[in-house]
Interface confidence: medium
């Protein structure tokens, strides 16, 4: 007996050939024999059965000897042994349909689960695989579940079912709603404006949603609120912003906010978090901020950080064209008595320069003694 | 029983074009990737790229993206790795393998490209 | 991507002898690990894969084992058919890549 498979929503055709290839008399059964579609005459006839409205054959190929017989938008319950009785003799077709389907919204958020649910006919033992577009695989039986998305996993899933050594293959696109990066630094001088930037990782027809920046300054003890917002089909308005800081917000994604000055009293880690319409859970998206300040105060030359570095950065202080160097793994360096010059100050990690900041270092003459 | 047969060895000249095959029988040939890996003369495996028979959808690793092109006939059960340009240092044995899941678990038995003026 | 070391790149033993090759994946891959073994002009054969699984018609004298970033590849007792490369080759995430080999010869 051939086996068949078919996906649900899907066309097949079963194939049926005669020996001579000439029109002759033919019919398509279900298991019941109850009769499906046949010739009489030059003519299709359609009996009793359930898919009598979504049946068909191919009357071009009849004369050829072929005498197929469509089923249009398969459903798993069309799964059975179709017999087709052409020139005294039997062939029999086993059809499995099977659809594969996720078990909730294919737009599903960073963190979430997804729950891929395979509908089989009575009967079948089929197994699933499947992979995902950056090539993770998993494979089970009439579940497959995938516990934590990642933004990678965000794209068309290709899964395959196996029955009794034939395959049918399913394409499921799958949106992982996620910032495209989960953290970023932004490193400024004392007094530069800040730009921070959250681009997401998808596109939806509308977005619509509300969020919040809450801010922990390195100097604060306690966290707070900087900006709340609304987010109306991809417009964004303001609802509440601190006074000190100032922030300002875009007003169109991808989501942007601006702070006027960088300070040490702002430098720090803030979590942007965004609640989409009709979905529960958040995104997330950490910023940090790290602000650089170079000072000369009477003879002491210091470059201080503030905000989260990591201790491998190496901060330094560095005169033009010169040697003279004072580098530390620390927040804060200095030269006591320095050279009269252009000194620089940099923030580095492994030789790549992060932040930099310029002093000028003028000669200070000796006091003339009073008579 | 499941088989990979490639296509024989071929003797080039830099710059020529070149399309090598892969013919699988024995399984479902739209239902499982086909994968490429090159051996350079004396080295280890390298893991070009993979392509979906059931709808050409291929993935390639970065090495490799632009300098090769897989491609497949699901009607003949073939898979394809081509060259528009090829360049000396495309002088290797390449084998396709069917892929299990990731696993190479069938393959072919692979084809010799010599590249050379 | 993920880099994937294997150590010894050379291994002289005799036949009998019990043989382990590491690999280590340059983060975590799960278990998402098959090793292969290739004799010279031929193509290479699946011996074990999701680590530790045995491929069908593979001797049972080949063993695999380990997750996350450290797998050996475990030969109980040597046979004169055994000496070949073998590469370790994960699959968790793309490009799927393979380690350098480790040819086994004998002593």
């Known amino acids: 007996k051939k086996v068949v498979l078919g996906k649900k929503g899907d066309t097949v055709e079963l194939t049926c050939n005669a020996s001579q290839k000439k029109n002759t008399q033919f019919h398509w059964k279900n298991s019941n024999q109850i009769k499906i579609l046949g010739i009489q005459g030059l003519f299709l006839t359609k009996g009793p059965s359930k898919l009598s409205d979504r049946a068909d054959s191919r009357k071009s190929l009849w004369d050829q000897g072929c005498f197929s017989m469509i089923i249009k938008n398969l459903k798993i319950e069309d799964s059975d042994t179709y017999i087709c009785e052409v020139e005294n003799k039997k062939e029999e077709v086993e059809l499995l349909v099977f659809g594969l389907t996720a078990n909730s919204d294919t737009h599903l958020l960073e963190g979430q689960s997804l729950t891929l649910t395979l509908e089989s006919p009575p009967g079948s033992s089929p197994s699933v695989k499947c992979r995902s577009p950056g090539g993770k695989n998993i494979q089970g039986g009439r579940t497959i579940s995938v516990p934590q998305l990642e933004r990678q996993d965000s794209g068309t899933w290709t899964c395959t079912v196996s029955q009794d050594q034939k395959t049918v293959e399913f394409k499921i696109d799958i949106v992982v709603l996620a910032f495209q990066k989960a953290s970023s630094t932004v490193y400024k001088k004392e007094g530069e404006q800040v730009e921070f930037s959250f681009p997401l990782a998808f596109t939806l027809e509308k977005l619509t949603g509300s969020g919040e920046l809450w801010w922990q300054a390195e100097r604060a003890s306690s966290s707070k609120s900087w900006i709340t917002f609304d987010l109306k089909n991809k417009e964004v308005s303001v609802k509440r912003v601190t006074q000190d800081p100032k922030l300002q917000m875009g007003k169109k994604l991808p989501l942007h906010l601006t702070l006027p000055q960088a300070l040490p009293q702002y430098a720090g880690s803030g979590n942007l978090t965004l609640a989409l319409e009709a979905k529960t859970g958040k995104l997330h998206q950490e910023v940090n901020l790290v602000v650089m300040r170079a000072t000369q105060f009477q003879e002491n030359l210091t470059c201080e950080v503030w905000g989260p570095t990591s201790p491998k950065l190496t901060l330094s202080l560095k005169l033009e064209n010169k040697g003279a160097t004072v580098s530390k793994q620390a927040k804060a360096v200095w030269v006591l008595n320095p050279e009269a010059g252009m000194w620089q100050c940099l923030l580095s990690d492994s030789g790549q320069v992060l932040l930099e900041s310029n002093i000028k270092v003028v000669p200070t003459w000796p006091t003339p003694v009073q008579p | 029983e499941v088989q990979l047969v490639q296509s024989g060895a071929e003797v080039k000249k830099p710059g020529e074009s070149l399309k090598i095959s892969c013919k699988g029988s024995g399984y479902s040939f739209t239902g499982y990737w086909i994968g490429w890996v090159r051996q350079m003369p004396g080295k280890g495996l390298e893991w070009m790229g993979i392509?979906?028979?059931?709808?050409?959808?291929?993935t390639y690793s970065p090495s490799f993206q632009g300098q090769v092109t897989i491609s497949a006939d699901k009607s003949i059960s073939t898979a394809y790795l081509q060259w528009s340009s090829l360049k000396a240092s495309d002088t290797a044995m390449y084998y396709c393998?069917?892929?299990?899941?990731?696993?190479?678990?069938?393959w072919g038995q692979g084809t010799l490209v010599t590249v050379s003026s | 991507d993920i880099q994937m070391t294997q150590s010894p790149s050379s291994l002289s033993a005799s036949v009998g002898d019990r043989v382990t090759i590491t690999c280590r994946a340059s983060?975590?891959?799960?278990?998402?690990l098959a090793w292969y073994q290739q004799k010279p002009e031929k193509a290479p054969k699946s011996l074990i894969y999701s680590a530790s699984s045995l491929q069908s018609g593979v001797p049972s004298r080949f063993s695999g084992s380990g997750s996350g970033t450290d797998f050996t590849l475990t030969i109980s007792s040597l046979q004169p058919e055994d000496f070949a490369t073998y590469y370790c080759q994960q699959y968790d995430s793309y490009p799927y890549t393979f380690g350098q080999g480790t040819k086994l010869e004998i002593k």
């Open positions: 983060q975590g891959i799960s278990s998402w």
């Open positions: 392509i979906y028979p059931g709808d050409s959808d291929t």
């Open positions: 393998a069917r892929d299990q899941l990731g696993l190479f678990d069938y």
